[in-house]
């Protein structure tokens, strides 16, 4: 007996060929002896069936001995063993329909689950493989977890139904809805302005929802609220802002904030949190501030830097186009006594600078430039 | 398995240069920055610099400024280490190491099995 | 430049005895940024490259047997073998990273008495 798979919804083909290479009497009918459709002649007959409305054949094929049956818009229920009779022969198909289905809405909040049924006939026993954008492989039976989505999980998945040695594939489209970065880091001088920016991975035609960013200042003991905001229509609308700092927020996607001037003491850290209109959980995106400053009393040279930095990076002071004069695993650095000149400070990772700040040491007797 | 496969042993003239080669095999050499450190025999270790192949960036102790030159091949994997102006007392093993996470200025956690530089006239 | 002195010079000890290494540097590897100190501990034996033990003056390396530890803050730093086996006969150098340039100390021989 041939085994052909379906997949729910779609459209199969089950083939009945005649040894005689022209139209004769065929009939196709399940396993219950219900007669689904014929011919009289060139025309096309139907039986009793359910499947009355769905069922076809292609009279264009009749002339060569062949004679289909095409079943539309498959459902479970129509896998059956289908017989068809033709010379005094019987041809038997058995059909198995599958559909596979993600549990909820197929646009997922990162973090969450992603839950993949299948659906199929009884004394069927299919085995079930799928594979994720980013190339995971999982495996299952009737259903398939995954737990804690990730951006990377975004994309097709595509998924291999096996029964009988034949198989059937699946393709389902995911939609993790994230921020395109879980974590950035800002590094400012003191005094200058400051962008945050929270580009979405995805997109969306309509884009409503609510937001807020909190904020964790180093030298402060508890984490406060600087802003929270409306979306709606992909539209940013401010609903309340601190007076310090006074945060500005851009009124177009990808999100954006501006605090005008960094300071030591707005360096810390951020998460910035954002819950969609029917959508239970809220997405996520820490942002890091870290400031320096260089500054020069009496004959003591300082550079400090405040916020998250890690105990990896390098702090140093060092007189322009000369070594290094102090370089080392602190948040401050002093020189005493510093010779005339343009001094930097330099955080830096593996010898890339990520923040500098020049200040010039005059002659003993005047006072110093800031840059 | 990352491996630090260091090129041979070398002779040389006092004057002369040498160049040591270091290539990383079974892993991504642009995640990782390269220092050279020598020891004389029966001597201590002592850092020379070191190299990020990322930025390029370069940093020498101040003891080989103006005469060490470490370079980066990334099509190669392959980090060098030349030296100049060649003395007796440069007779050393010159060792590559690589910084443990990537991190520069750091502790090594993998090293090359050393390549011997002879210096005599 | 920070300056890394061991002692002793060379180390004689019983197998299954203690051996104790001390290193002082010049100046201090701890950051009070980061609370940690910037030390690094390493094995050498002849003909092979340094391998490390040892680091943040007192984590130890994967895979290395627990015998070694490594103990102090700030200047004074320690590397104990609780129990010296055959295989440990070597050379051990102290290592800074807190400040640049990475200096190493002169090292200390372990042979057994």
């Known amino acids: 007996k041939k085994v052909v798979l379906g997949k729910k919804g779609d459209t199969v083909e089950l083939t009945c060929t005649a040894s005689q290479k022209k139209s004769i009497q065929f009939h196709w009918k399940n396993s219950n002896q219900i007669k689904i459709l014929g011919n009289q002649g060139s025309f096309l007959t139907k039986g009793p069936s359910k499947l009355n409305d769905r069922a076809d054949s292609r009279r264009s094929l009749w002339d060569q001995g062949n004679f289909p049956l095409i079943i539309k818009n498959l459902k479970i229920e129509d896998s059956d063993t289908y017989i068809c009779e033709v010379e005094d022969q019987k041809e038997e198909v058995q059909l198995l329909v599958f559909g596979l289905t993600a549990n909820s809405d197929t646009h997922l909040l990162q973090g969450q689950s992603l839950t993949l049924t299948l659906e199929s006939p009884p004394g069927s026993s299919p085995s079930v493989q799928c594979r994720s954008p980013r190339g995971k492989n999982i495996q299952g039976g009737k259903t398939l977890s995954v737990s804690q989505l990730e951006l990377q999980d975004s994309g097709t998945w595509t998924c291999t139904v096996l029964q009988n040695q034949k198989k059937v594939e699946f393709k389902i489209d995911i939609v993790v809805l994230a921020f395109q970065k879980a974590s950035s880091i800002v590094y400012k001088k003191e005094g200058e302005q400051v962008e945050f920016s929270f580009p979405l991975a995805f997109t969306v035609e309509k884009l409503t929802g609510s937001g807020e960013l909190w904020w964790q200042a180093e030298r402060a003991s508890s984490s406060k609220s600087w802003i929270t905001f409306d979306l709606k229509n992909k539209e940013v609308s401010v609903k309340r802002v601190t007076q310090d700092p006074k945060l500005q927020m851009g009124k177009k996607l990808p999100l954006h904030l501006t605090l005008p001037q960094a300071l030591p003491q707005y360096a810390g850290s951020g998460n910035l949190t954002l819950a969609l209109e029917a959508k239970t959980g809220k997405l996520h995106q820490e942002v890091n501030l870290v400031v320096m400053r260089a500054t020069q009393l009496q004959k003591n040279l300082t550079c400090e830097v405040w916020g998250p930095t890690s105990p990896k990076l390098m702090l140093s002071l060092k007189l322009e186009n000369k070594e290094a004069k102090v370089s080392k695993r602190e948040k401050a650095v002093w020189v005493l006594n510093p010779e005339a000149g343009m001094w930097q400070c330099l955080l830096s990772d593996s010898g890339q600078v990520l923040l500098e700040s020049n200040i010039k040491v005059l002659p003993t007797w005047s006072t110093p430039v800031q840059p | 398995q990352v491996q630090l496969v260091q090129s041979g042993a070398e002779v040389k003239k006092p004057g002369s240069s040498v160049k040591v080669s270091c290539k990383a095999s079974?892993?991504?050499?642009?995640?990782?920055?390269i220092s050279w450190v020598r020891q004389a025999p029966g001597q201590g270790l002592e850092w020379m610099g070191w190299?990020?192949?990322?930025?390029?960036?370069?940093k020498y102790a101040q003891k080989f400024q103006g005469r060490v030159t470490i370079t980066a091949d990334e099509s190669t994997s392959t980090a060098y280490m030349e030296l100049s102006s060649l003395r007796s007392e440069d007779t050393a093993v010159y060792y590559c190491?690589?910084?443990?996470?990537?991190?520069?200025?750091?502790?090594?956690?993998?090293w090359g099995r050393g390549t011997l530089v002879t210096v005599s006239s | 430049d920070i300056v890394m002195t061991q002692s002793p010079d060379s180390l004689a000890v019983s197998l299954g005895e203690r051996a104790t290494i001390n290193c002082k540097s010049s100046?201090?590897?701890?950051?009070?940024?980061?609370?940690?100190?910037?030390l690094a501990w390493y094995q050498q034996k002849p003909g092979q490259p340094p391998k490390l033990l040892i680091y943040?003056?007192?984590t130890r390396e994967s895979g290395v047997p627990d015998r070694f530890s490594g103990s102090g803050s700030g200047t004074d730093f320690t590397l104990t073998i609780s129990s010296l086996q055959a295989e440990d006969v070597a050379v051990y150098y102290c290592?800074?990273?807190?400040?640049?340039?990475?200096?190493f100390g002169g090292g200390t021989k372990v042979e057994i008495k």
């Open positions: 943040w003056a007192s």
């Open positions: 190491a690589r910084g443990e996470a990537g991190n520069l200025d750091w502790y090594f956690d993998l």
């Open positions: 079974g892993g991504t050499f642009s995640s990782y920055g």
């Open positions: 100046q201090t590897v701890f950051s009070t940024s980061y609370n940690k100190n910037y």
């Open positions: 290592q800074q990273y807190y400040s640049t340039p990475l200096t």
């Open positions: 190299i990020n192949p990322n930025s390029g960036g370069t």
